[in-house]
């Protein structure tokens, strides 16, 4: 996961006129036992904020050691601090656990900036505000790290919820969620409601604040409004999806849709920003500037380096456009759109100068690894990771920040043709061609 922080193009794509609508096949998905309803014990089990990640309380070992663990849908390792570190209040002490088993194997995970390394083992793991089960899971005990832990974030480890294909050191290391599903009757599905505060939180407020919910094994109707719309998981590695169209205030960016997914598009709770491929980012910023009276704002603002501030309570949300991403639907030639507000893509930050100002960072940034739908997107929606049916669902979050004029939205269906062509096929290294 990126913590925030050359292709064959098809021309003339853009789908049919988006006024054309297809009938919904059914109004609701059929009920499946244990998958829907109320999960009271799991609601409000996340804390944190988009800039530093959302975390859930977990226990590891026997007797149980309590740790706060970052929820990360953009990686696949369960890894926890296991040695003293200046930014950690506590860490996993393997020697105190009677159920710890050493796998006698190391793991090294480099990021664009920073890295962690550790020793692999297994132990008993449970989630106090989750399903009432205990599982034996792989754990990477982090013994050394650089620019990984965040000062003041209040989490001590990371729960990678993506698929085994991207696990380190290789795909033979079973991820936590796979172990959970295999060892228990928990359905192969989880859902996330990340609640952005809409205003900066100081340290004590973060500790006291509720950050949202991770519902393990189901869908809680109280966490969203309207209907859930599903997009296929293109490939089970990251949670990869396909974006088929992008609009700024209803104006189509009119790019070849392959550009939107170059070289992939993923849903990643461990990334702060909405990250866009370079060409798409440049076009989007140009369009955002044109749609608002912000064209003369300093370049540093659009690069996410410089804050913009307004007198407290006077942020002019209406001068900024809404952003819509159209996602491939479950039905042939059908798409739906998710729409976020500036309340999602302008991230509140603490401005130490004055409490008279509300200050924000532009939380859309450029990427060289494809589109990353990070926390700023997810904070608008209740997101269902339906692994059993290889799809991701979006509905308007009951906790998203909005104003009296506009709200985030999930709408459909829309007619969009040739959506399969929007996916980028990453060249595979064909080992047979390397034979001499």
């Amino acid at each position: 996961t990126q913590h925030g922080i050359r292709l064959p193009l098809r021309s003339g794509l853009g789908g049919a006129p988006l006024g054309l609508r297809l009938p919904r096949e059914t109004d609701e998905e059929p009920e499946e036992p244990g998958r829907r309803g109320s999960f009271v014990e799991m609601v409000d089990n996340l804390r944190g904020k988009s800039g530093q990640g959302y975390y859930v309380e977990m226990t590891v070992g026997s007797p149980p050691q309590t740790l706060n663990i970052l929820v990360d849908t953009g990686s696949s390792n369960f890894a926890v601090g296991a040695a003293p570190h200046p930014f950690l209040h506590r860490y996993y002490q393997r020697q105190l656990s009677s159920t710890y088993r050493d796998l006698r194997k190391g793991v090294y995970v480099p990021y664009t900036q920073g890295k962690w390394e550790g020793e692999l083992g297994t132990d008993l793991v449970s989630i106090p505000h989750g399903p009432n089960v205990t599982v034996r899971a792989n754990i990477a005990a982090i013994t050394e790290s650089d620019k990984f832990f965040i000062n003041g974030s209040n989490w001590e480890g990371i729960l990678g919820l993506a698929y085994a294909e991207i696990a380190r050191p290789d795909d033979s290391l079973e991820p936590f969620f796979d172990s959970l599903v295999k060892q228990t009757h928990v359905p192969n599905l989880f859902s996330l409601q990340l609640c952005g505060a809409g205003f900066p939180l100081n340290q004590s407020e973060v500790l006291a604040s509720v950050g949202g919910s991770m519902i393990i094994g189901g869908i809680d109707h109280s966490l969203y409004t309207g209907s859930l719309w599903y997009t296929p998981i293109r490939r089970e590695w990251y949670y990869e999806v396909i974006i088929v169209r992008v609009e700024i205030n209803g104006q189509d960016l009119k790019m070849d849709c392959k550009e939107y997914n170059y070289d992939k598009s993923i849903v990643d709770s461990g990334t702060t920003n909405l990250r866009l491929p370079k060409k798409v980012f440049e076009a989007a910023v140009k369009s955002i500037k044109a749609a608002s009276s912000t064209e003369k704002f300093p370049d540093g603002f659009w690069l996410g380096e410089q804050l913009v501030c307004w007198q407290a309570g006077t942020t002019p949300w209406n001068i900024f456009p809404v952003i819509s991403l159209y996602l491939m639907g479950e039905v042939t030639n059908q798409s739906f759109r998710i729409t976020i507000l500036p309340q999602q893509y302008l991230r509140p930050v603490e401005d130490v100068a004055t409490s008279q100002d509300d200050c924000y960072k532009f939380a859309i940034s450029q990427s060289s690894t494809g589109t990353v739908m990070g926390a700023v997107i997810m904070e608008g929606f209740y997101v269902v990771f339906d692994r059993a049916r290889k799809r991701i669902g979006f509905a308007v979050s009951a906790c998203h920040v909005h104003d009296e004029f506009r709200t985030a939205a999930v709408e459909g269906p829309f007619v969009t043709l040739d959506m399969e062509d929007c996916g980028y096929n990453i060249p595979q290294t064909d080992e047979s061609t390397l034979m001499t």
């Epitope: 608002s292 009276s293 003369k296 704002f297 501030c309 307004w310 006077t314 002019p316 100002d357």
Partner: nanobody, 125 residues
């Protein structure tokens, strides 16, 4: 034309505060931004804070003053202010108010068309 007149400079101890004012007159409604710049002896002019009336008073700060200085405006009085807290000896400079209606972004001094005469700020340790 636009005329700009600064006031409020002076001498202060490190850690102290000052509030600078910039009274604007003339065709101020055509200006899309006002800025406070400073020039220390032997150094280039630098923009320290910008305010955009056309974007409902959006404000930006340079890294060197962010968290210590606050720019604000009183549109009824056609005045722009710079509240300077936690002053440091490195803040010693001539401070200028400037305004512009052109298309350059806010942190290039060359992008400003109209300038005041300046007001001196001296911070001693």
């Amino acid at each position: 034309d636009v005329q700009l007149q600064e006031s409020g400079g002076g001498s202060v101890q490190a850690g102290g505060s000052l509030r600078l004012s910039c009274a604007a007159s003339g065709y101020t409604s055509e200006m899309n931004r006002f800025a406070w710049l400073r020039q220390a002896p032997g150094k280039d002019r630098e923009v320290v804070a910008v305010i955009f009336p056309t974007a409902r008073g959006a404000k930006f700060y340079s890294d060197s003053v962010n968290g210590r200085f606050t720019i604000s405006q009183d549109t009824a009085k056609n005045t722009v202010y710079l509240q300077m807290n936690s002053l440091e000896p490195e803040d010693t400079a001539m401070y200028f108010c400037a305004a512009s209606a052109n298309a350059m972004t806010g942190f290039q001094p060359s992008g400003y068309t109209y300038w005041g005469q300046g007001t001196q700020v001296t911070v001693s340790s």
